[in-house]
Interface confidence: medium
């Protein structure tokens, strides 16, 4: 038996974090995002659930909808109609997948002060939204789209093809929701509310993933989801636009797919309304290195949508896949013809380009060895975007304004010097034409949300500064967080190290690597967090490190596309390289190194444990992918190509966790998975376990019955983190 090692933060009245603190969410922070309803007005749900109206210019504020009205139908969300006559109240929230959920909706008439009776909405509804003007309602019920001209009117049924697990109208199927759209909806109103565009997904030929949901009954029920795994048949997509003024006169009109896309399997990737009669559709080949942006116009005389060839813009990657995680969307200028878009420049860095006629003639607006990340708003004279340019830290986000009215355009960093130590990672929320905006800072200090004048960038007021959190953290010993870079050969890897309080470089500490490492992800970010790993550093004296290896985002395509067609290689090698560098720093106990990850991170941690390097004593994989053949087509094929002999089958086979089963013999491995994981199917862990058993390798495992990919139910989450804590403490010989 080895003597147990207990970490005791010395001589300080402050207390260490406890696991209970983390599980109870004691130190969670708040953000404040205004729900803009005009250039200078917004709504916000108060702490006590009143919906409050604010006017920035008159300083007026009042309750537009009381918490008692909300409570009367157990509402948890709301939506104001643009004419401000009605509010929908959302209740009976029932989660489906990552973004999708069903709910019951009630319409409240603000003028009459009562709920709208007659022609009430069916339940449960899959999606509901107001038109951008007036108070038309579009909603999806049982996979079909319905329209109401006014909340009290009878509904008009727009589609009739909807069928559970077969045809989806206005809402995405599983794979489009998770891997392409990242929304629960697939319908978009034109700016004036005349047209409604929607997508129809036909999943009739897609193989079904089936798994048991145990519930409380005598027999488990089976969940069936059309889920295309790598190489399988994909959804067939069609885009339609319906005139909502006369929906019964003319049916939905299909928008043509560009010829170069339609010639083989393809995806629809996004829709952007440009003006009331112009729409922009983005398409992607199944081999996701070619994307086509197609601008289409309404032809009154044909009553059809026309997408001329000269309005097709092709974006192609020669080194990997098109776009970042998703292909970026265009931000159109006032002229409704030209647009701004982020894509790779000749040096492989993602930057803003201005496209007036053709992509070939695009004018590069930003440049440098950093990346533009998101375009928030384009107005007549300004373009607001975020980037990681400032001081060369890829894990920061600052907001910039380019004055496009000037010639040449001038650039200003809006956020770089506001609260330099506290705030290095921002997002923003703009009013319609950017007359005002809110800045939300996520760290590295305590998050703070502020309101600003869109012309002068002056701070108007603090919306949320997390004072209570600041006070409650006063007597807590938080670890020290460092963000630095290490060099290996010609490569630079950014890492975040979380060091125990009273860290002493002359002592030796156990090391836990937390890894995600998926393509186009980023773990090393300058954000505030008090979570499980914070606790492990604070209370248990464990050094935590997160490393962004090759394949991660915002450092150029050379770094990003290094993993193209060979997942599971460099992500793992770079973690190993980093561990070796950390050992060289002198304060790591080489005999107590562990790695853990969830999802893609579970895949990487498993491969790292099975690397045969002997670097790790133990590790944990939660809900890991174990073979890219088991995962969704859109994701797997984006990065790996097809699992066919003439494409990339060999690497699909080589990169499985199962192929390395014998290499787990000299590590302690804890494998964890939820049985109702709709995303990374339990099959992945079942196959790892089978391979380990066949290789006669001992390992530990835990399943969570009826839990999905997030293992997020309160009891399960508590059990999970408690279990992982015990495992780690045992591995590191830390006493309980």
């Amino acid at each position: 038996l080895r003597p147990s090692r207990v970490y005791k933060p010395e001589g300080n009245t402050k207390r260490a974090l406890t696991l209970k603190d983390i599980l109870n969410g004691t130190f969670s922070y708040k953000t404040y995002f205004p729900n803009w309803i005009s250039e200078q007005e917004y709504l916000h749900q108060s702490e006590d659930d009143n919906i409050v109206f604010y006017n920035i210019e008159t300083r007026e504020s009042y309750i537009i909808l009381s918490n008692s009205t909300m409570k009367s139908v157990n509402a948890t969300d709301y939506g104001l109609s643009p004419d401000r006559q009605f509010v929908y109240l959302e209740s009976d929230y029932s989660k489906l997948w990552r973004y999708s959920y069903t709910a019951t909706y009630y319409i409240y008439d603000l003028q009459n002060g009562e709920f709208v009776r007659g022609y009430e909405l069916p339940r449960p509804i899959q999606y509901l939204c107001w038109s951008p003007v007036g108070s038309k309602l579009a909603y999806v019920y049982q996979n079909n789209i319905y329209l109401k001209q006014r909340p009290g009117d009878p509904p008009f049924q727009i589609t009739y093809t909807g069928r559970e697990n077969r045809i989806f109208n206005g809402i995405p199927d599983w794979v489009y929701e998770e891997e392409m759209l990242a929304t629960k909806y697939a319908l978009w109103w034109s700016p004036d509310g005349k047209f409604l565009a929607y997508v129809e997904f036909n999943d009739s030929d897609i193989p079904i993933i089936a798994y048991s949901y145990y519930g409380d009954g005598q027999y488990p029920r089976t969940i069936n989801i059309p889920y295309p795994k790598a190489g399988a048949k994909n959804p067939v997509v069609r885009v339609f636009i319906v005139d909502t003024t006369y929906p019964h006169h003319v049916g939905p009109m299909e928008v043509p797919v560009p010829e170069m896309i339609a010639s083989s399997d393809y995806y629809f990737s996004w829709l952007t309304w440009v003006s009331s009669e112009r729409v922009c559709l983005q398409w992607l080949k199944r081999v996701q290195n070619v994307s086509v942006l197609s601008i289409c116009d309404f032809r009154e005389d044909w009553h059809a949508w026309e997408c001329p060839k000269n309005q097709e813009h092709v974006e192609e990657s020669r080194t990997g896949w098109a776009g970042g995680f998703f292909v970026s969307t265009p931000a159109f200028s006032q002229d409704a013809t030209s647009y701004y878009k982020i894509f790779s420049d000749k040096d492989g860095y993602k930057h803003i380009h201005y496209i007036k006629d053709t992509v070939e003639n695009a004018i590069q607006i930003t440049s440098g060895k950093w990346e533009a990340i998101y375009i928030f708003r384009v107005t007549q004279d300004s373009l607001f975007y975020s980037s990681n340019e400032f001081e060369g830290y890829p894990g920061r986000r600052n907001i910039y304004r380019i004055s496009i009215g000037n010639s040449p355009p001038s650039k200003k960093c809006v956020t770089c010097h506001l609260r330099k130590e506290r705030c290095q990672y921002y997002t923003a929320s703009f009013s319609y034409k950017a007359k005002y905006y809110a800045l939300v800072c996520y760290g590295p200090g305590l998050p703070i949300s502020t309101l600003h004048d869109g012309r002068t960038d002056q701070e108007i007021q603090v919306l949320e500064e997390n004072k209570e959190l600041e006070n409650s953290l006063r007597n807590i010993q938080l670890p020290k967080v460092e963000i630095k870079k290490l060099k290996d050969g010609g490569l630079t890897f950014w890492y975040k190290m979380i060091l125990p309080p009273q860290f002493d470089r002359s002592k030796k500490y156990p090391l836990l690597i937390q890894v995600y490492g998926g393509p186009c992800s980023q773990s090393v970010k300058s954000v505030f967090a008090v979570n499980w790993i914070t606790y492990l550093a604070s209370k248990e004296g464990i050094v935590i490190a997160l490393v962004d290896g090759r394949g991660t985002a915002f450092q150029g395509d050379k770094f990003l596309h290094a993993v193209y067609r060979k997942l599971g290689v460099y992500e793992v090698e770079d973690q190993l390289t980093a561990v070796r560098k950390f050992i060289e720093m002198g304060f790591i106990d080489e005999e107590r190194i562990a790695i853990w990850g969830w999802s893609y991170g579970g895949y990487v941690s498993s491969l790292a444990l099975a690397s045969g390097t002997g670097l790790f004593k133990c590790g944990i994989a939660v809900a890991p992918v174990s073979s890219w053949e088991y995962y969704a087509s859109i994701y797997s094929e984006r990065f790996m190509g097809l699992p066919t002999k003439d494409d990339n089958l060999e690497h699909y086979k080589n990169s499985t966790v199962m192929a390395r089963a014998e290499y787990f013999r000299n590590v302690d491995y804890l494998l964890i998975h939820g049985t109702a994981d709709d995303n990374v199917h339990f099959q992945n862990s079942a196959q790892i376990a089978k391979a380990l058993v066949n290789a006669q390798v001992d390992f530990q495992a835990m399943w969570y019955s009826d839990q999905n990919h997030g293992i997020s139910s309160g009891r399960s989450q508590n059990h999970l983190y408690t279990h992982m804590t015990h495992f780690l403490k045992q591995c590191f010989s830390l006493s309980d």
């Epitope: 290689v569 460099y570 099975a610 002997g614 192929a659």
Partner: antibody, heavy 116, light 108 residues
């Protein structure tokens, strides 16, 4: 049964080149770190080079850096050592070995003689 | 680089006797990173011990490893005729991996 079979050794003049191969069987080759270790006649063991499972990371002893190149073909379960600008002091039996920290399996070795 | 010094250079013993071989590192080496090998004339080396004290597959229990920091020991509790060979220690904590110069165990 794990087997490592080296080939490609022989007599070569100073400044010349040789390519050694090591055919692996009996274990899953693609994730395994592999190394070359040499032993001059009547002398001890000297580590020469190592390569990660994917081939993405390579490591060399200072004495061979810039002259030797380690590579692998996972589809053929084969490890290679390309030796250029050979010198008399490179004369040795070259072993291919599985591993990086501890070399748990070794080939029988192939003799490389550099002499004019 | 980390230099490993083995002693004695040669050990003359009879079958049945206990052999104690020493390996000293020029700087501290974590146990995880130390291995021992046996090599007989005309043969490739064979892994005996890894992680300073763990026996490799198929190695008889008369072979044991111990030590930490800079001093490591390989012990053969009762020498068998087939144990007469050259023994090398090896570290892989420092880059590059290095071997000791070897200890020859010969029949007295």
């Amino acid at each position: 049964e794990v087997q490592l079979l080296e080939s490609g050794g022989g007599l070569v003049q100073p400044g010349g080149s040789l390519r050694l191969s090591c055919a692996a069987s009996g274990f899953t080759f693609s994730p395994a770190y592999m190394s070359w270790v040499r032993q001059a006649p009547g002398k001890g063991l000297e580590w020469v080079s190592a390569i990660s499972g994917s081939g993405g990371s390579t490591y060399y002893a200072d004495s061979v850096k810039g002259r030797f190149t380690i590579s692998r073909d996972n589809s053929k379960n084969t490890l290679y050592l390309q030796m250029n600008s050979l010198r008399a002091e490179d004369t040795a039996v070259y072993y291919c070995a599985k591993g990086w920290r501890a070399f748990d399996y070794w080939g029988q070795g192939t003799l490389v003689t550099v002499s004019s | 680089e980390i230099v490993l010094t083995q002693s004695p250079g040669t050990l003359s013993l009879s079958p049945g006797e206990r052999a104690t071989l020493s390996c000293r590192a020029s700087q501290s080496v974590s146990r995880n990173y130390l291995a021992w090998y046996q090599q007989k004339p005309g043969q490739a080396p064979r892994l005996l011990i890894y992680g300073a004290s763990s026996r490799a597959t198929g190695i008889p229990d008369r072979f044991s490893g111990s030590g930490s920091g800079t001093d490591f020991t390989l012990t053969i509790s009762r020498l068998e005729p087939e144990d007469f060979a050259v023994y090398y220690c090896q570290q892989s904590l420092g880059y590059p991996p290095t071997f000791g110069q070897g200890t020859k165990v010969e029949i007295k």
